[in-house]
Structures are given as structure tokens and as C-alpha cells.
Interface confidence: low
């Protein structure tokens, strides 16, 4: 009652290996690493057969089939390429994930190489079975920002793509009687978050309570160059409007806010985020040069009072920008203390501009980012937000523009963007 000699399957083995197999002897068929036993269209690790009384084996020897990891999962904001010929997805095949450059980069700077493991899963040395994450690249416009700027008073037209983080925020507060409409600027921090000044998003009430405008009343435009032609721009409604809880309407202390967009915006040459600074109380050093852009008043012959009294909020049609030096806190404080009126320059603010005037931000530029190039990281960083100015006309002599010191709020910003209250989990490159 001997059973016939067994031939092990290709890429497999039989245990125990005996010269003779008799009735009731059992053998276990297993496959080499990266192969699985294939029997009746079912895949298993091992398969047992037995020598029967009539000298026949209970089953045929199964085959060993190479493990197949299948088509790799798609990567959000990335792509996958096959390193192995014929786009093989079997054991020891390699694939490489990469992010959509130059707009996204890989978190943790992993190689992005995944190998088909013996377990049938695509595996990376560092991330194991987890997919890599493609994060937005911040503060690196596709067009290099210029070094020199002549004299959004004393500014010049920006070319499309120079300030890809620049957002136009339009607020139409239908809860007011009569309806109130105004605008400001903001800066894109990620696909879903806009940084701006709190006063841009405060409901224009007749008292001093700070109530944010309803999200339904906010529209954000990105990739916009000329306000007369919004066809190429991305417009988005707001999912959330978050004012800094300590924003003070009397002195504009803590003048900072966030808008979470209803839908993430696609990044590209004309829509890219700005970087946040490191959290440090010092803020930008005096004499450092920064750039600020906006669609605010650019006509030095029109006074702010005229604009306010006429009820219109005059825009520059084309995005303007200006280069301004940071002014020491002491000098700025002194310049405002010498004026009549209660002008408080707090530690949450810094000033920029020229003693002789001529270049400045103005009404309508509010909330726009004052950006400084960080030599160490080679990124542009939002160090300030256009906040307020003195009683005189924009660009007046010895009246500096006052900016929210963003570095004081980095922790608050990250908390809000990653809090359980956020509409969805978002990661942003710092």
C-alpha cells in the first residue's frame, strides 16, 4: 500500500521528504518565501495531503504561485511609478511614490520606494504599510519675487504668480441694515486655510462687541490678479470663520483670524501657500525688508476720509505690492505716542515703512501678509498681517503701517487648524 513518489512543486517543498510513503503518511506542501500554495483557486500558506489505503494520494500536489500585491493605492497629490519592467506587482517588485512637484513635497523626506512583500502588501522601510503624505510646499512662488520695488501707495503692479498665497476676501454682510459689503486680503496657509486680520472678518456692528461675520457672507478668491477679471481665479466659500478670542476692537490687539475653506483648493503656479514663522516673541528684526501685496487704495490723491464718507471701498484693479523695512518697536511706539488719540502699539504688533513716507499699505489691504524671505529655509514667511495705520493719509511722513506679529500666534493657529472643531483633519507644512 505504498503511494507514488511525490515531486515538489516549482518554488516549493514537501515535508517530510521520504523515499517511501505508506498508508496514513502525511506530507505538508509549502512554498518558498514570496510564493503561496494555489489549490482550487484558493490561496493558502500550506497544504496537507495523505497517503490513502488504496495507494493513492488524497489530493494532487498544488502549485506555488508568486505573491501579487495588486495595483498600488493612489496617492493624494502624488503619483506612483513602477520600477520593475512590465509594471509587475508581484513579490519583490518595486514602486516609487512621488509628490506633485513643485507644489507638494513628501512628509518625513522618505524615499517613497515600496516593495511587494511576501505578505502581499506594498511595504516601505520607514512607513511600513502606510502611504506617504504629500504636503503643500509653502513660500516658494513659481516666479522669483523681485529684489527691488520702486515706490499699495507707491507700489507697483504685481505679475500673475508673484504672490500665489494672496487671497481677496469679500464680505457681504446681509445681516446688517443696509447690507454692508467690504473686502480685505488674506494669505493661503494650506489647501483649506486662509490667514487674515480679525478686523476684516468682524461684523461691522454699532457697538464694540466682537462678533465674526457669518461664514455664509464670506467669499475668498485665490489666484486672482485683476479684480475686473475673476475668470481665472478660484473662488471659495467659508466653512468656518475663526477670530482670535482676545481680539480687541478698541486697539486692534490680537488682530488675527482664520478662514477654513468649504473645499480644499487645488494648488498650482498661481495658488500656493505661504509659510508660518517659528513661534518666537521677537518677530522680525528692524531694517529687515518685507513685501506686502493688496488691492487696496493705490491713488495717493484720494484721502481715506473721502473713501469712507462716500461709502465705497475703492479697489486697485490689479494687485499691487510694495517693499518696506521693519521699523524698531521703540521708534514706532514713539511716532504714535506723539499723536493725539489713543494709539497703542502692543507687543503683538510691529511696524514697517519709511520715515519720509511715500510707500505704505492702505485701506483695503487689511489682512494681507507681510512676507520676509528666510535665508535659512529659502522660503518666504508671513511675519505680519496688515492691521492698522495712523490718522493721517496712507504713506504720510513718519506714519508707519502697523502689522500683526504673526510669530506670537503660531501655536494658536496650529491649535485651531488641528483642533477637534476643525471641519476635517488638516496637516500643513511649517
Amino acid at each position: 500500500n505504498e503511494c507514488p513518489k511525490l515531486q515538489p512543486p516549482v518554488y516549493g517543498k514537501i515535508e517530510p521528504s521520504q523515499a517511501v510513503y505508506s498508508f496514513k503518511d502525511q506530507v505538508l506542501v509549502s512554498c518558498d518565501t514570496g510564493y503561496k500554495v494555489l489549490k482550487d483557486n484558493g490561496v493558502m500558506d500550506t497544504f496537507q495531503i495523505e497517503c490513502l489505503k488504496d495507494g493513492a494520494w488524497s489530493n494532487k500536489i498544488p502549485t506555488c504561485k508568486i505573491v501579487d500585491c495588486g495595483a498600488p493605492a493612489g496617492l493624494k497629490h502624488g503619483l506612483v511609478t513602477f520600477s520593475t519592467r512590465n509594471n509587475l506587482t508581484t513579490y519583490k517588485s518595486e514602486i516609487r511614490y512621488s509628490c506633485q512637484q513643485p507644489y507638494y513635497k513628501m512628509l518625513h523626506n522618505t524615499t517613497g520606494v515600496y516593495t511587494c512583500s511576501a505578505h502581499g502588501t506594498w511595504t516601505n522601510e520607514v512607513l511600513k504599510r502606510s502611504l506617504p503624505t504629500c504636503l503643500p510646499v509653502c513660500g516658494q512662488p513659481s516666479r522669483a519675487l523681485p529684489n527691488l520695488v520702486k515706490r499699495i501707495i507707491g507700489g507697483r503692479n504685481a505679475e500673475l504668480g508673484l504672490f500665489p498665497w494672496q487671497a481677496l476676501i469679500v464680505v457681504e454682510d446681509t445681516s446688517r441694515v443696509p447690507n454692508d459689503k467690504w473686502f480685505g486680503s488674506g494669505a493661503l496657509l494650506s489647501e483649506s486655510w486662509i490667514l487674515t486680520a480679525a478686523h476684516v472678518l468682524r461684523s461691522q456692528r454699532r457697538d464694540n462687541t466682537v462678533i465674526p461675520v457669518s461664514k455664509e457672507h464670506v467669499t475668498v478668491y485665490l489666484g486672482l490678479h485683476d479684480v475686473r477679471d475673476k475668470s481665472g481665479a478660484v473662488n471659495s466659500s467659508a466653512a468656518r470663520v475663526i477670530l482670535h478670542p482676545d481680539f480687541n476692537i478698541q486697539n486692534y490687539n490680537h488682530d488675527i483670524a482664520l478662514v477654513q475653506l468649504q473645499k480644499p483648493v487645488p494648488l498650482g503656479a498661481h495658488v500656493m501657500p505661504i509659510c508660518l514663522p517659528r513661534p518666537e516673541p521677537e518677530g522680525p528684526a528692524p531694517h529687515m525688508l518685507g513685501l506686502v501685496a493688496g488691492w487696496g487704495i493705490s491713488n495717493p490723491n484720494v484721502t481715506v476720509d473721502e473713501i469712507i464718507l462716500s461709502g465705497t471701498r475703492t479697489l486697485s484693479d490689479v494687485l499691487q505690492y510694495v517693499k518696506l523695512p521693519v521699523v524698531s518697536h521703540a521708534e514706532c511706539k514713539a511716532s504714535y505716542e506723539s499723536r493725539s488719540g489713543n494709539y497703542s502699539v502692543t507687543e503683538n504688533m510691529f511696524c514697517a515703512g519709511y520715515y519720509e513716507g511715500g510707500k505704505d499699505t492702505c485701506l483695503g489691504d487689511s489682512g494681507g501678509a507681510f512676507v520676509i524671505f528666510d535665508e535659512m529655509s529659502q522660503h518666504w514667511v508671513a511675519q505680519g498681517l496688515v492691521s492698522w495705520g495712523g490718522p493721517e493719509e496712507c504713506g504720510s511722513k513718519q506714519v508707519y503701517g502697523v502689522y500683526t506679529k504673526v510669530s506670537n500666534y503660531v501655536d494658536w493657529l496650529w491649535e485651531e487648524m488641528n483642533s477637534p472643531r476643525a471641519v476635517r483633519d488638516l496637516q500643513v507644512e511649517r
Epitope: 462687541t209 462678533i211 457669518s214 461664514k215 468656518r240 501655536d411 496650529w414 491649535e415 488641528n418 477637534p420 472643531r421 471641519v423 511649517r430
Partner: antibody, heavy 114, light 112 residues
Framework: QVQLKQSGPELVKPGASVKLSCKAS????????INWVKQRPGQGLEWIGW????????KYNDKFKDKATLTVDTSSNTAYMDLHSLTSEDSAVYFC???????WGQGTLVAVSS | DIVMTQSPSSLAVSAGEKVTMTCKSS????????????LAWYQQKPGQSPKLLIY???TRESGVPDRFTGSGSGTDFSLTISSVQAEDLAVYYC????????FGGGTKLEIK
């Protein structure tokens, strides 16, 4: 000053539903979410969920997804919690809290008994 | 879901003694971006509503006596009462707010 005033005790039959209320005063109701917490007699605290009055957005503890429904009425500055298909396991004190748990209601006792 | 484990479940100390209770989370509560631990401590006296004592693991809520100190980071946290007073008789709960909210089982503090 900030106050959260909750509705009075409830004695309900198994299988029935009950609606608890939490009336806020002393702050702008729409600026912060309202949390609801359960505490069975002699037991610990269990987070049920929260609601953001400004846009009615809610988040629930998975355990309470089919048990509780959170709503608000901004005209009366009141948050509500509906509890459905009550069993003896739902007998507990239910608290509401706001302004990041700085302020709490006094609690509402719900007793489920036939 | 994040699981919060408190120990001991109860302890009895004399007035004036120092007491420490611990809270462990099943995953880190430290947000590396904000550099904050999303853990809070609450005190619940008999028949009362809970009261917030500490947030961000170590920041004392305004009006809370300075004998209450929170410490720890990542997954291991503790609440210390430097000199227990009779009015500290209560159950103390930790709560994570890193991902939604979960309370620990509580530590009952009794005064000898």
C-alpha cells in the same frame, strides 16, 4: 456672569424618549460649542458629543451615535439633547458644558423605570 | 479610540499631605506642531458638577489654587496636590482632547 441652566429631573419608561435642555446666558451662545456628558450613579464621566451653535455642526462619541441627538435653538440660547429607546443603562445624570468646559450645568437626572 | 487609564482608583490621605495621581493614554497626546499636550484634569466634588482644574497638561485654570499642579507629556501624566485640604475631597478625572474627548475612570480622593 456665565450660566448653563439645565432642565429638571425626568422619570421615563423603558423604550420611551426624553429631551433635555441646557439654557446658556452671560456669553454669546454661538461663539462656543456645547458639550454633553453622561454620569451613571457612582460611575465616571462619559463624553456624549458636542454641537457648535453657529452652524449646527455636531460630533458624537461612537457609543452614543444612535442614542443621542444634539440640537440648538439660537433664538433662546438653548441646547437640547434627545435620548431615544431608553433602557435602565441610560439612567444617569447628564451634564452640559460650554466655553471649553469652563462652565457646567447643574446636571439633569434621568431615571428609566417601568 | 484613545483609552485613558487612571491610577489609583482611590486613595486616602491626611490633610497637609502631598498626593499624586496618574493618568496614562493609549497614544500620545502631544501635538508636535503646537507643542501642547491635549490633556485636562477635572475635580468633581460629591453632588456637584465637574470643575476644570488644569488644561494642556500643566496650565492651571484661572482661580484654581496653586497647590494643584499638572505635569507630564506624551502618554504619561500626573496631577499633584502639594498640601491636601479637607475641601479637596473629590473624584479627579483626566480627559484627552487630542482626538474628540475621552475621560479616565477617575481617582477618588478621601481625607483620613
Amino acid at each position: 456672569q456665565v450660566q448653563l441652566k439645565q432642565s429638571g429631573p425626568e422619570l421615563v419608561k423603558p423604550g420611551a424618549s426624553v429631551k433635555l435642555s441646557c439654557k446658556a446666558s452671560g456669553y454669546t451662545f454661538t461663539t462656543d460649542d456645547i458639550n454633553w456628558v453622561k454620569q451613571r450613579p457612582g460611575q465616571g464621566l462619559e463624553w456624549i458629543g458636542w454641537i457648535y451653535p453657529r452652524d449646527d455642526r455636531t460630533k458624537y462619541n461612537d457609543k452614543f451615535k444612535d442614542k443621542a441627538t444634539l440640537t440648538v435653538d439660537t433664538s433662546s440660547n438653548t441646547a437640547y439633547m434627545d435620548l431615544h429607546s431608553l433602557t435602565s443603562e441610560d439612567s444617569a445624570v447628564y451634564f452640559c458644558s460650554s466655553l471649553e468646559d469652563t462652565y457646567w450645568g447643574q446636571g439633569t437626572l434621568v431615571a428609566v423605570s417601568s | 479610540d484613545i483609552v485613558m487609564t487612571q491610577s489609583p482608583s482611590s486613595l486616602a490621605v491626611s490633610a497637609g499631605e502631598k498626593v499624586t495621581m496618574t493618568c496614562k493614554s493609549s497614544q500620545s497626546l502631544l501635538n508636535s506642531r503646537t507643542r501642547k499636550n491635549y490633556l485636562a484634569w477635572y475635580q468633581q466634588k460629591p453632588g456637584q458638577s465637574p470643575k476644570l482644574l488644569i488644561y494642556w497638561a500643566s496650565t492651571r485654570e484661572s482661580g484654581v489654587p496653586d497647590r494643584f499642579t499638572g505635569s507630564g507629556s506624551g502618554t504619561d501624566f500626573s496631577l499633584t496636590i502639594s498640601s491636601v485640604q479637607a475641601e479637596d475631597l473629590a473624584v479627579y478625572y483626566c480627559k484627552q482632547s487630542y482626538n474628540l474627548y475621552t475621560f479616565g475612570g477617575g481617582t477618588k480622593l478621601e481625607i483620613k
